[in-house]
């Protein structure tokens, strides 16, 4: 014998109170699936979570993070702080990368600089807080006559010989 | 019943201060931080300042460094921001939530329904 719940589509609940009739989800609430017995309680984005799509009598509600903080977990269960880049966040807030670190990002943790010696590179650019070093040729690569990442030396004055 | 209750919120003159109160009550405040956030009208909310468990601070905006300070009363379950130098553009309506920890808020924690701030020019 068929099930008459089974007969309820979503955006109703089969309602034993009256005689297992089809009746429409109450407000704030859903059921995403037909032949359900009770509609769920939409989810309400309370704070530093901001809805991003409203609750319907099918769908449940979802949030993001307001800005200034990102989305963790499954369905944004959890609103995390930004940095600035240049930053990791601690147990004690944002704190800047150590000397040899970086980060590009407003979330993750800073990670350290490109070490290009051990592809046998150069140093072309140096790393900041913010940014990776950037990896030259190798001193192998450079012909002659061929400019060096190296600053010129400073002109000496006239007069001063070498000593 | 876990509630959370805004308190202190009026109408200022630029330049004025306020002190608003966040009071918990139906939780073990003691491990819980507290965040300010704010809401003016046609903006996004935004984070103002946060007080941790242990009574360390974070700041969330810049622009309320050197002018908001925060700071908690375990005895009396109250966190009050204390706001000096108040401007136009603090005008907003301002709530507490109470994560266990500043830097991540869950979907669970529980929040409070806001005061109101106006400041005049």
């Known amino acids: 014998l068929q099930d008459p719940c089974s007969n309820c589509p979503a955006g109703t609940f089969c309602d034993n109170n009256r005689n297992q009739i089809c009746s429409p989800c109450p407000p704030n609430s859903f059921s995403s699936a037909g032949g359900q017995r009770t509609c769920d309680i939409c989810r309400q984005c309370k704070g530093v979570f901001r809805t991003r799509k409203e609750c319907s009598s099918t769908s449940n509600a979802e949030c993001d993070c307001t800005p200034g903080f990102h989305c963790l977990g499954a369905g944004c269960s959890m609103c995390e702080q930004d940095c600035k880049q240049g930053q990791e966040l601690t147990k004690k807030g944002c704190k800047d990368c150590c000397f040899g670190t970086f980060n590009d990002q407003k979330r993750g943790i800073c990670r350290p600089w490109t070490n290009c010696s051990l592809d046998g590179k150069s140093v072309l650019v140096n790393g900041t807080k913010e940014r990776d070093v950037v990896c030259g040729p190798s001193p192998a690569d450079l012909s002659p006559g061929a400019s060096s990442v190296t600053p010129p030396a400073p002109a000496r004055e006239p007069g001063h010989s070498p000593q | 019943q876990v509630q959370l209750q805004e308190s202190g919120g009026a109408l200022v003159q630029a330049g004025g201060s306020l002190r608003l109160s966040c009071a918990a009550s139906?939780?073990?405040?003691?491990?819980?931080?507290i965040g300010w956030f704010r809401q003016a009208p046609g903006k996004e909310r935004e984070g103002v300042l946060c007080?941790?468990?242990?009574?360390?601070?974070?700041y969330y905006a810049d622009s309320v460094k050197g002018r908001f300070t925060i700071s908690r009363d375990n005895a009396k379950n109250t966190v009050y921001l204390q706001m000096t130098n108040l401007k136009p553009e603090d005008t907003a309506v301002y709530l507490c939530?109470?994560?266990?920890?500043?830097?991540?808020?869950?979907?669970?924690?529980?929040w409070g329904q806001g005061t109101q701030v106006t400041v005049s020019s």
């Open positions: 939530g109470a994560p266990r920890d500043c830097s991540r808020y869950s979907s669970d924690d529980y």
């Open positions: 007080i941790s468990s242990s009574g360390g601070s974070t």
């Open positions: 139906g939780f073990t405040f003691d491990d819980y931080a």
